[in-house]
Interface confidence: low
């Protein structure tokens, strides 16, 4: 085909200019009200009928082709008539107190009938009933400070824990390691109020009666429950709940902090072992177990009667194809459904999605076709494990893996209104570099200056001087799969809160009633302005990675890259210097790949300078190698107990969903590596890790090699 | 304001098919949300739920009928209809359709009703 | 199936006088129960559901009450418009949703 038909015989630059210029705030701004009106829990009546909607708003917009995209995954409720609650009952097992059935409406939604109440999604049914351990976070170290330090066991016990640093599946699994029957989760104030900012809705603080809802499953990117590996569809082998992956074992339960003061005022045992423990009630933050003194008899109970049903979802799936490579795909995906809500999290994101998808179809009907293929998705029951997500990129792994370009995500804009946060494979950090150097910062004090000069100010690199931060790819989003399982380099961007000053884990009223979309206009962001900065960051990047003729891809960044992380896991590993010696262990076959790949990436950035760009199969061949070079770090053995963690650079922190591990599979093989009772296999286990990370970086190396 | 009106023949035969169609107006079947049922009344036997339908396809029915009902929808017309197939004596009522909300609603009473239409089932 | 059953079958009672009308379930339903109205000739008309709520525009002299499996409807002061037959129905359990067999409300 000619090429004027991808650009309309407009320049790239005019495109990208006329693209950006094309997102409004007000269309973002009535989008998200316009996604906000009810609840949107997936597999209800209400997120299918958002679904529809999308599909036909996108038709209008001037997509090619919209489809929902269905599954019938493992999803889990709570049972209307049989509410879970936790008691405290005294000697004669009479209850002297119960936690609150639901959260307060807020105001102007009091009418609003389907809001699903605070739940643990997942949770075993059960009503265990003992004694309370507090657990701080649930973190591994605090259960090491427990068991191993104040000799503190929690084999049979209830424990409670505040939500914070690390994922609540985590949590969840470290308190099943931990002998514990039962688990409450709440947010505490320390973590979930920032002094001085008022409780919604005079502000964007939690009231005491709020509650984070959220999964506590452990998946490991396996998707669905029932179908690790492969999609939900009708053909699909189902395995028995009882081999499902992930589910947890104990009943769990979330509260807010008004109904954990009750819980938490009476406690016995020790104090807590440090300030780091002590949260913000007006309670000793005592650890247990049980109560003290008068309350001695008085037990906790947990009353949890939810539920697991095979549920379909809906994924809406929109296709632009590309004018010049329709087999080149590049990936925008973010979540629809939401626990009440999602005045945030999703729909600031989705709105988002929504008015991109505009632009590219308004530029589409001017005859303005990108040169590659875009995907814009709308996934379903990422809430309930990222589950719509990964059951498409199981159905459709082998075009993903074959023509997948590039994945943007697109959840939540906003966390806050500080900067911007940036996640992404080193492979896009000079994209994104670039394309906030030719955007306007939005942010006050910053009037006529870059997006990257206020980024920079506010959130520096640890690392490179005078760079702003971009962090490691860990998972608890819809990149997962793509990243993690399939090699498909991504990114994500969103504004964020000041980290140095604000405290607070997530945003205070994360997956809870208040997450409405007066807290956005009245709090976050009244002139919508931060949204639309996150729009044209996630614009652009589709944009740029959609029509460069050259993919904007940095294989030297990653060579950066690789040595620091080398350098990190010899630091962690040379903590055991006597066992390093007599085990033999050595990183000096991992260096020396590094500094191959090094030598390599730096040979095809010459070659790519030389490029004559308009052969089209020296161009091609190129591109293949910068868009394969992510997936050159796929393992298909995967890690250690984790098949669908395949990336050996990257990997979901085993410790903390969240966050992104480098190294992973040489990380966990020295984790608490001196307690392992059987030390000569444990280092052994090392040093099979750094042969497979030498391998793979090797590998990678030679793909970059020139082809002949 | 919606509004809902059955139509369907008066009268038909012992084992034949009886088919009924509910034109809903003032409302689209896919954005409201709402489930839509059929219900029939006997002077013997009351009030009987006969199944319900959403506009995604899905459906739900009277287990005591379920072997020979079938519901299903037109959303380009604003149709739902109900085939009974192998009609008896027993079958004779006045048969309404009906809105409601849904299992996953605490809410779920018909709150809209169309005014019914008689059907004799006789040779 | 859920078995609702009406009580008492007939009531005669005066205007201005006030209707107790009662509906048991066989099971649980909790507070899934509505009431309806039904007058000859016409469709039912819903007056209350989630056992105690009452539909929109329906008089407050209708009150529901109960939950669980003992249920009851009042009429506070009946006017003579509100002579009609009356039904339970449970929506905890379904399917089948499943109605009582009506208390016919009439005028002494």
């Known amino acids: 085909k000619p090429s004027n038909e991808a650009t309309g015989n407009v320049s790239h630059s005019g495109m990208k200019k006329e693209f950006l210029h094309e997102l409004k705030a007000e269309n973002i701004k009535k989008f998200l009200y316009n996604f906000t009106r009810t609840p949107h829990l997936a597999g209800t009546q209400n997120n299918f009928e958002l679904a529809k909607q999308i599909h036909d708003q996108w038709k209008e917009f001037g997509l090619d082709l919209v489809e929902l995209s269905h599954y019938d995954v493992l999803l889990s409720y709570p049972n209307k008539t049989h509410p879970n609650y936790i008691s405290i009952i005294n000697e004669d097992g009479n209850e002297i107190f119960k936690t609150s059935l639901s959260e307060q409406p807020p105001p102007g939604y009091e009418n609003i009938s389907d809001v699903v109440p605070p739940y643990s999604a997942f949770s075993p049914q059960g009503t265990p009933e003992g004694d309370l351990v507090y657990v701080n976070y649930a973190r591994t170290e605090d259960f090491f400070k427990l068991e191993r330090e104040m000799k503190i066991s929690c084999s049979g016990k209830i424990v409670i824990a505040r939500y914070g640093k690390v994922f609540r599946g985590n949590m969840v699994k470290n308190a099943q390691l931990a002998g514990a029957k039962g688990m409450i989760l709440y947010s505490d104030p320390a973590d979930y109020f920032v002094p001085a900012v008022k409780s919604y809705p005079d502000g964007w603080n939690l009231p005491g009666g709020g509650v984070q809802r959220g999964n506590v499953l452990n998946l490991n990117g396996a998707g669905d429950p029932l179908t690790p590996g492969y999609p939900a569809n009708e053909h699909a082998y189902r395995h028995e709940l009882t081999n499902a992956v992930g589910l947890p074992s104990i009943p769990v339960h979330p509260i807010g902090y008004d109904d954990a003061q009750k819980l938490l005022e009476h406690m016995g045992g020790p104090a807590p072992p440090d300030s780091s423990w002590k949260g913000g009630l007006k309670v000793p933050y005592n650890v247990g177990p049980g109560f003290a003194g008068n309350f001695s008899t008085q037990k906790v109970k947990m009353h949890i009667h939810s539920y697991t049903k095979v549920t379909r979802i809906y994924n809406v799936i929109g296709t632009l194809k590309g004018a010049l490579e329709p087999d080149r795909y590049v990936i925008l995906g973010g979540h629809r459904d939401a626990w009440v809500f999602g005045g945030i999290d999703p729909q600031s994101g989705a709105a988002v999605v929504h008015e991109i998808v505009r632009s590219f179809g308004t530029l589409k009907k001017k005859g303005r076709r990108p040169r590659r293929t875009i995907l814009f998705a709308s996934w379903d029951a990422e809430e309930f494990g990222l589950l719509g997500s990964t059951e498409w990129a199981e159905e459709h792994s082998r075009l993903l893996q074959e023509r997948g370009v590039a994945y943007i995500n697109a959840d939540s804009s906003i966390e806050g209104n500080y900067t911007l946060r940036v996640d992404c494979t080193p492979l896009m950090y000079s994209l994104v570099y670039n394309l906030t150097k030719e955007l306007q910062s939005p942010d006050e004090g910053f009037e006529g200056k870059s997006l990257y000069d206020s980024w920079k100010e506010k959130s520096p690199s640890p690392e490179f001087i005078g760079m702003p931060r971009i962090s490691k790819l860990g998972s608890g989003n819809d990149f997962e799969v793509f990243f993690q399982r399939l090699g498909i380099a991504s990114g994500r961007a969103r504004y964020t809160k000041n980290w140095k000053t604000n405290k607070v884990s997530s945003y205070p009223l994360y997956h809870s009633v208040y997450e409405t979309y007066e807290l956005v206009v009245k709090f976050y962001d009244p002139t919508f302005k931060y949204h639309l900065t996150v729009a044209q960051v996630r614009g652009a990047m589709v944009f740029e990675l959609a029509n460069s003729i050259v993919l904007p891809f940095d294989c030297q960044s990653y060579a950066v890259a690789l040595k620091k992380y080398a350098d990190t896991i010899y630091n962690i590993s040379m903590k055991h210097p006597q066992e390093m010696k007599a085990y033999m262990i050595s990183f000096d076959s991992l260096f020396s790949a590094v500094n191959n790949f090094t030598d390599v990436a730096s040979k095809f950035n010459q070659r790519l300078q030389e490029l004559d760009k308009s052969n089209p199969i020296l161009l091609r061949i190129m591109n293949d190698q910068l868009m394969y070079l992510e997936r050159a770090f796929i393992d298909p053995l995967g890690l250690p107990g984790r098949p669908f963690y395949r990336h050996i650079i990257y990997a979901p922190s085993s410790h903390n969903k969240y966050a992104g591990e480098s190294f992973p599979g040489i990380y966990d093989a020295l984790f608490d590596i001196s307690s392992k009772v059987n030390a000569s296999k444990a280092w052994n286990e090392v040093k099979r890790q750094i042969s497979i990370a030498t391998f793979t970086v090797q590998a990678a190396a030679e793909t970059l090699r020139e082809v002949a | 304001q919606v509004q809902l009106q059955e139509s369907g023949p008066g009268l038909v035969k012992p084992s034949e098919t009886l088919s009924l169609t509910c034109t809903v107006s003032?409302?689209?079947?896919?954005?409201?949300?709402?489930?839509w049922g059929w219900i029939r009344q006997t002077p013997g036997r009351g009030l009987e739920w006969i199944g319900t339908?959403?506009?995604?396809?899905?459906?739900y029915y009277n287990p005591s009928l379920k072997s020979r009902l079938t519901l299903y929808m037109d959303t380009s017309k604003q149709e739902f209809s109900l085939r009974l197939t192998s009609v008896t004596a027993a079958d004779t009522a006045v048969y309404y359709c009906?809105?409601?909300?849904?299992?996953?609603?605490?809410?779920?009473?018909?709150?809209?009703w169309g005014q019914g239409t008689l059907v004799t089932v006789s040779s | 199936d859920v078995v609702m059953t009406q009580s008492p079958a007939t009531l005669s009672l005066s205007p201005g006088e006030r209707a107790t009308l009662s509906c048991r379930a066989s099971?649980?339903?909790?507070?899934?129960l509505a009431w309806y109205q039904q007058k000859p000739g016409q469709a039912p008309r819903l007056l209350i559901y989630?056992?105690?709520t009452r539909a929109t525009g329906i008089p407050a002299r209708f009150s529901g009450s109960g939950s669980g499996t003992e249920f009851t409807l009042t009429i506070s002061s009946l006017q003579s418009e509100d002579f009609a037959v009356y039904y339970c129905?449970?929506?905890?359990?379904?399917?089948?949703?499943?109605f009582g067999g009506g208390t016919k409300l009439e005028i002494k």
């Open positions: 989630g056992a105690s």
């Open positions: 099971q649980s339903v909790s507070s899934y």
């Open positions: 129905q449970q929506y905890n359990n379904w399917p089948p949703l499943t």
């Open positions: 003032g409302a689209s079947f896919s954005s409201s949300g709402y489930y």
């Open positions: 009906a809105r409601h909300r849904g299992p996953d609603s605490g809410l779920d009473a018909f709150d809209l």
């Open positions: 339908m959403f506009y995604s396809g899905a459906t």
